[in-house]
């Protein structure tokens, strides 16, 4: 019960998870201007993944696309990549949980096979964790680095100049939203592998055992109390004997008529 | 790559009238903010009038009534229609677009400025 639980929580906290890195990326706030009282009007200015935007103080709203990769900062293209391998992972993930949960029954799927995927899955939601974590970290990294705040690089042409505008940027909702949802899918991950444990324990033969004289006689088989791995016959975890043959711990706990001679 | 240039200043009498003109080329004209500064001899760079994309126009308090902004974007060409011109009005005057989408660094495009001079 406890494992199905554990399962179950796992896929449902990966699952919010990548829904939210899903959203971080998609967010048009990775990065935000302070209120920047530019003469014309009071412009507020943010930046995504994939395209940036302005806001006037009259409400006017506009956001273009980046339309080149030429004039990308590497990193951003390397926070794009991390942030879609984490998608990618996450959602395989996802799929391959919805297989493993323990509460659904596909066919004749033995346990084993349930706690492989569930192990996947759990790696999967991990990566997928720490590629979103990473995102988000290499991009804050470049706004408290003042990647594209450095004095402006300003040269002459025919046209006269151009500039970067000198402006201050802070973390948007976006990193947020892209920790968080990174450490819950995280966290999922490690939950699933835990789950993984749980569904396959490790095969355990009880040898020791103390026979006693019995009125009628039994074949004993051995490896009576073997573990179910999927993998024998014995998949319900029955006592295969049962007739005066106990582990040493059940010694003398019931006196029977067969000890007294 | 984009080129602001100017034109449409020279000598002109007090009380008279000019009209800048700024033809933009690389860039639309109906960009984030467009706006005119100017920087008359031994002073800073001053904000004469603007106008954003969402179409709000602001104006120094120092020409409000006297120069009207205004753009063309079938031409692609930022205008200053400066009326009641002042000695102090003596300045080169510089067109600027400032692009915020669609770029990941936000960008200041600068002319190379037209001399205005008011003088009897």
């Known amino acids: 019960m406890a494992v199905t639980a554990c399962q179950g929580l796992g896929f449902v906290v990966s699952l919010i998870g990548i829904a939210g890195i899903i959203a971080a990326t998609c967010m048009d706030q990775w990065s935000t201007q302070d209120l920047y009282n530019n003469p014309v009007t009071a412009v507020f200015n943010y930046q995504g993944l994939w395209r940036s935007c302005v806001r006037e103080s009259s409400g006017f709203t506009e956001c273009r696309g980046y339309f080149t990769l030429l004039g990308l900062p590497a990193m951003l293209q390397a926070v794009r990549a991390l942030m879609i391998v984490g998608i990618v992972l996450g959602a395989i993930g996802l799929l391959v949980s919805i297989f493993a949960l323990k509460c659904i029954r596909i066919g004749s799927m033995e346990d084993s096979a349930k706690a492989n995927m569930t192990l996947t899955s759990g790696i999967m939601f991990i990566v997928s964790g720490l590629c979103a974590i990473a995102g988000v970290s290499v991009f804050a990294n470049m706004l408290v680095t003042n990647f594209w705040m450095s004095t402006a690089n300003m040269y002459t042409g025919m046209g006269g100049m151009v500039q970067t505008v000198q402006t201050r940027y802070t973390f948007g909702a976006a990193l947020f939203v892209g920790w968080v949802a990174g450490g819950l899918t995280l966290i999922g991950g490690v939950m699933m592998c835990i789950a993984c444990r749980g569904l396959a324990p490790e095969e355990t033969n009880y040898k020791a055992v103390s026979y006693h004289a019995s009125g009628h006689s039994v074949a004993y088989k051995p490896g009576g109390f073997k573990a179910s791995t999927g993998f024998g016959s014995n998949t319900k975890n029955k006592k295969i004997y049962d007739g005066g043959a106990r582990t040493e711990d059940e010694v003398q706990s019931y006196p029977s008529k067969h000890d007294y001679v | 790559q984009v080129q602001l240039v100017e034109s449409g200043g020279g000598l002109v009498q007090p009380g008279g009238s000019l009209r800048l003109s700024c033809a933009a080329s690389?860039?639309?004209?109906?960009?984030?903010?467009m706006a005119w500064y100017r920087q008359a001899p031994g002073k800073g760079l001053e904000f004469v009038s603007g106008?954003?994309?969402?179409?709000?126009?602001n104006y120094a308090d120092s020409v409000k009534g006297r120069f009207t902004i205004s753009r063309d974007n079938s031409k692609n060409t930022l205008y200053l229609q400066m009326n009641s011109l002042r000695a102090e009005d003596t300045a080169v005057y510089y067109c600027?677009?400032?692009?915020?989408?669609?770029?990941?660094?936000?960008?200041?495009?600068w002319g190379q400025g037209t001399l205005v001079t008011v003088s009897s």
């Open positions: 106008l954003t994309r969402g179409g709000s126009i």
């Open positions: 690389g860039v639309d004209i109906s960009s984030d903010v």
């Open positions: 600027n677009a400032e692009i915020y989408t669609g770029t990941f660094y936000p960008r200041s495009y």
